[in-house]
Interface confidence: low
Amino acid sequence: DSSKWVFEHPETLYAWEGACVWIPCTYRALDGDLESFILFHNPEYNKNTSKFDGTRLYESTKDGKVPSEQKRVQFLGDKNKNCTLSIHPVHLNDSGQLGLRMESKTEKWMERIHLNVSERPFPPHIQLPPEIQESQEVTLTCLLNFSCYGYPIQLQWLLEGVPMRQAAVTSTSLTIKSVFTRSELKFSPQWSHHGKIVTCQLQDADGKFLSNDTVQLNVKHTPKLEIKVTPSDAIVREGDSVTMTCEVSSSNPEYTTVSWLKDGTSLKKQNTFTLNLREVTKDQSGKYCCQVSNDVGPGRSEEVFLQVQYA
């Protein structure tokens, strides 16, 4: 009864020419131990012979003799639990279906595993949180659907082409559920990181470049402002005029409102980027700043201390 065979392994494994593939696999045949195992490449059932045709990558034989391929392809499993496989090195033409032909005393089974081998190392994938806000710690994740015991790799983070100083945590999974290498970087972006390019670079054990993925940082931040005053020393006599200008050096998203504050209190009807004070009086002395808001919140400029002296 073929329904007795239960297998667990990743559905598809990914690798590239010259690397290797490690296939974690468990199985169960209720009627006893495995008696024969053949690993096929792209097996096809032949109705005439009632057997499978295809390239035999590995074959267990009574006398222990094995095809030459077996140096490259290893069955690392056991008689009734483990069907782990290793192909090292793996080649482009290994792509396709691997067929695990298992036979016990009374049962037979063909289990299929997909193998996707690319010509060159495929790029990792950077995953960012849905929103990044300035000064809030985020985790950048770089995921590569590859891991193999015989082919060590490393993932390196770069910001504008320069290695990032923060310590990344790299983890690998080689389980029946998933095969991957992942690097996680905790990072507190500043507003100045907005628009900058982050790269996750795949390297071999010697640090040689294999592939990469890049993303542009979208750092949400309050408006960043500069205030300019004429005269520049902000010291005037009563009756003089003063002009203050608010410049937005950066805002993400776009700003929505502008206001001016004197000594922390909002000045009514002053909602433009220029504050014109004509014929100033002594009581207009104080600390002035502009405030510009966006969906993240308000941003304030530095304060300018206006000193109005008697004429």
Partner: antibody, heavy 120, light 112 residues
Framework: EVQLVESGGGLVQPGGSLRLSCAAS????????MNWVRQAPGKGLEWVGR????????NYSGKFKGRFTISADTSKNTAYLQMNSLRAEDTAVYYC?????????????WGQGTLVTVSS | DIQMTQSPSSLSASVGDRVTITCRSS???????????LEWYQQKPGKAPKLLIY???NRFSGVPSRFSGSGSGTDFTLTISSLQPEDFATYYC?????????FGQGTKVEIK
Amino acid sequence: EVQLVESGGGLVQPGGSLRLSCAASGYEFSRSWMNWVRQAPGKGLEWVGRIYPGDGDTNYSGKFKGRFTISADTSKNTAYLQMNSLRAEDTAVYYCARDGSSWDWYFDVWGQGTLVTVSS
Amino acid sequence: DIQMTQSPSSLSASVGDRVTITCRSSQSIVHSVGNTFLEWYQQKPGKAPKLLIYKVSNRFSGVPSRFSGSGSGTDFTLTISSLQPEDFATYYCFQGSQFPYTFGQGTKVEIK
């Protein structure tokens, strides 16, 4: 350090029952077969059976099927040998032994043994 | 069941002697996955057995190089190239290729 410690042995009357325990530590208990092997006084070793704690799969030597039952509790990292309808010829030191390799299959770690004496 | 027959049942030897113990199975113990699960264990009085050799000829970690295993099919040999005082013990062969797994009856190595 991988360790196996048997317990539960002792004197039992013919026809009686006894449950032996094998407490494992220092490795992933559920992922290795656990075997029971016995040795009658002055005699050789005899394989009783085994269990795969991960899913409870068992195999027995034919002569013990029916009377002996092997079980495991993964929450306690312990394997058991339940022995029923005991006879004088079941008097022996009972060892548990781990299959230490997934494919090479050898008993790399043994318990110290526990003596079962069946006598009236 | 597969019978494992060891010879001799006992032997007397001196320190420095070369000792050979043979084990014959009643049928082939080559598992059809290609391996022969033939092991050798050493047991001293009142102690649990210790693994020496697995898969016919592979020395287990920590086992001195004076112990070696060989053979194929149904005939297997354990050789101690130069017997040491601590080697006086009983030696068992074991097959783990077919159920039920079976041990040989043992070979006791005594001091001459």
